[in-house]
Interface confidence: low
């Protein structure tokens, strides 16, 4: 079998034990609480082992090398990076009971940045209180083989390059591996070496194809506008440099005095129409992207954008037409935090003449429509070259209006 562990585009967990250890030996005297969490691959939530802060157990373990495996590898042999002794590789068989009973020590998540230049691994220690008192270092050893031979493949130690991971926040370290564009489809082999208080934790060999783990940059240019048919159009553009189509997750919340609506939609286009929009409401929207047709990682969410609708919404907001034609305006009217029922809406032209009720239509409970038939040319009124069409609540008209140019 292939001795390297294939990384999926998810968070995964590293569990460690001293060589030749048994369950009873494993750090239990030092205050580690037993744990019976399952191994079903849900790695997002991790139970934090509890250590006493005296450090006595660490001094006992000084110079010990802990060999680590991934939770999903319980019943497999687990290969380690090349060891110091003559460049040979250890393959350790691990008792699966250990993994059922002892929760893991590290969460690891890796991805290729959206610019396709840097492969990043975040190594998060679950010994939250432990490493503040110890000299904590994380190194990532990696190799991009020129030619991948048949499995099993374990490069010799000398062929690995090492990067020092940035652990400015002690519990979370960032390891950056530069990947040439020409090698994005190649298999990257790597392993982690974590040192703390003289104890070395060593991961198994991991393999990954960077192109399958792209985390795009967040979508750009998120904006919203009301369409001529009264929908809210949410639009954005895909981030630059992504070499494949993306799917997008759009989450938006609508907040008005009458309703709070939240939605979460997956789309492959760079826009989304939201219907039944309400006047006097605010819409907060965020969007993120992920590879459409293969494995990948969701980008971070874009910066939230907020769009606020007016108390009176006209759609379309203006119409330009020719003499003799028929046109319609729609309106939704909100007054004193209530949406005016459409049957109570009246329409006025230029606040001077009431439009006959025969020209009204009730489209829905809240949407009123007025239609103009066989239109005459607009007569200029001072500097105004259009007719102002007002949607009113009985005798009270909002200052906003729609514009009719004939």
């Amino acid at each position: 079998f292939n001795l390297s562990y294939p990384i999926t585009p998810w968070r995964f967990k590293l569990s460690c034990m001293p060589p030749n250890s048994t369950y009873d030996y494993f750090l239990l005297p030092a205050g580690l609480s037993k744990n019976t969490s399952n191994s079903n691959g849900h790695y997002e939530t991790a139970v934090e082992p509890k250590f006493n802060s005296s450090g006595t157990h660490f001094s006992n373990l000084s110079k010990t090398t802990f060999h680590c495996c991934f939770r999903s590898e319980q019943d497999r042999n687990c290969s380690l990076c090349a060891d110091n002794i003559e460049g040979k590789t250890f393959v350790s068989t691990v008792n699966s009971l250990v993994f059922q009973q002892i929760d893991a020590n590290w969460n690891i998540q890796c991805w290729l940045k959206g610019d396709l230049k840097l492969f990043i691994c975040y190594v998060e220690s679950l010994f939250k209180n432990l490493f503040r008192n110890y000299n904590y270092k994380v190194h990532l050893l990696y190799v991009l083989p020129e030619v991948l031979e048949d499995s099993p493949l374990v490069p010799q130690k000398g062929s690995f390059q090492m990067v020092h991971c940035n652990c400015s926040v002690h519990e979370c370290c960032e390891c950056l591996v530069p990947v040439p564009t020409a090698k994005l489809n190649d298999t990257l082999l790597m392993c982690l070496k974590i040192t703390s208080g003289g104890v070395i934790f060593q991961s198994p060999l991991m393999s990954v194809q960077p192109i399958n783990m792209v985390k795009p940059d967040p979508p750009l240019g998120l904006h919203m506008e009301i369409t001529d048919d009264g929908n809210l159009k949410i639009s954005w553009s895909s981030p630059p440099l992504v070499p494949f189509p993306l799917q997008y997750q759009v989450k938006y919340s609508e907040n008005s005095t009458t309703v709070i609506r939240e939605a979460d939609k997956i789309v492959s286009a760079t826009s989304l129409l939201v219907d039944s929009i309400l006047p006097g409401s605010s819409y907060e929207v965020q969007v993120r992207g992920k590879r459409l047709d293969g494995p990948g990682i969701w980008s971070d969410w874009s910066t939230p954008r907020v769009f606020t609708t007016q108390d009176v919404i006209y759609f379309p907001p203006k119409i330009l037409t020719s003499v003799g034609s028929n046109v319609s305006f729609h309106c939704i009217y909100k007054k004193e935090n209530k949406i005016v029922p459409s049957k109570e809406i009246v329409w006025w032209m230029n606040l001077a003449e009431k439009i006959p009720q025969s020209q009204y239509d009730v489209v829905s409970d809240h949407v009123s429509k007025v239609t103009f038939f066989n239109l005459n040319e607009t007569k200029p009124r001072g500097k105004f070259t259009y007719d102002a069409v007002y949607c009113c609540n009985e005798h009270e008209c909002h200052h906003r209006y729609a514009e009719l140019y004939v």
């Epitope: 940059d217 750009l220 240019g221 904006h223 506008e225 954005w236 910066t303 203006k318």
Partner: antibody, heavy 117, light 108 residues
Framework: QVQLVQSGPEVKKPGASVKVSCKGS????????ISWIRQAPGHGLEWMGW????????RFAQKVQGRLTMTTDTSTSTAYMELRSLRSDDTAVYYC??????????WGQGTLVTVSS | DIQMTQSPSSLSASVGDRVTITCRAS??????LNWYQQKPGKAPKLLIY???SLQSGVPSRFSGSGSGTDFTLTISSLQPEDFATYYC??????????FGQGTRLEIK
């Protein structure tokens, strides 16, 4: 190709208004917004405001809010910028710029507005 | 409002030189940064959008980098037509959209 063509230079007295037009061609006018940006002589760029060509939605810089009116006419693919109560420090070249997912990717040639008594 | 500060305000260089202009935002703007070139009497021209993406038609000697608060525009090998004023601009937090004060690039 995408082009934005602006109206010609204007000379105005303090307190007057000026209206500058910007005609777009080579793209679907209603799919984009138009921003107005000005540049006083020897100075940098100052964003004034933005209008969505499809919905008429607007955003303003605080400095000109209340004096600036932006409109669009999608039938002629033209955007208009009107600045009222002109002062001498409004003397500048006024630019329109197409504003989509890549802000200001195409610009008009600029319109010099001189405010002088 | 987010302030954009460019440095230097002006610099002199020769044809063939490698030139770097920096732009700093008063708060993090992610990658929502654009670079423009303006020649005397002309409208600005978009060079780089989203911090590092080259606008179509712009020569590859122009490149942008950075994210968060610190950004750079690099011209790898100056050509005679590159002498101009360069502006950075953020579109992260709007309104208002804000520009840097400009960097004037002159012939040495």
């Amino acid at each position: 190709q995408v082009q934005l063509v602006q109206s010609g230079p204007e000379v105005k007295k303090p307190g007057a208004s000026v209206k500058v037009s910007c005609k777009g061609s080579g793209y679907t006018f209603s799919w984009y917004g138009i921003s107005w940006i000005r540049q006083a002589p020897g100075h940098g760029l100052e964003w004034m405001g933005w209008i969505s060509a499809s919905s008429g939605n607007t955003r303003f810089a605080q400095k000109v809010q209340g004096r600036l009116t932006m409109t669009t006419d999608t039938s002629t693919s033209t955007a208009y910028m009107e600045l009222r109560s002109l002062r001498s420090d409004d003397t500048a070249v006024y630019y329109c710029a197409r504003t989509g997912t890549r802000p200001f990717d195409y610009w008009g040639q600029g319109t010099l507005v001189t405010v002088s008594s | 409002d987010i302030q954009m500060t460019q440095s230097p305000s002006s610099l002199s260089a020769s044809v063939g030189d490698r030139v770097t202009i920096t732009c700093r935002a008063s708060q993090s703007i992610s990658s929502y940064l654009n670079w423009y070139q303006q020649k005397p009497g002309k409208a600005p021209k978009l060079l780089i959008y989203a911090a590092s993406s080259l606008q179509s038609g712009v020569p590859s000697r122009f490149s942008g980098s950075g994210s968060g608060t610190d950004f750079t525009l690099t011209i790898s090998s100056l050509q005679p037509e590159d002498f101009a004023t360069y502006y950075c601009q953020q579109s992260y937090s709007t309104p208002p959209i804000t520009f840097g004060q400009g960097t004037r690039l002159e012939i040495k």
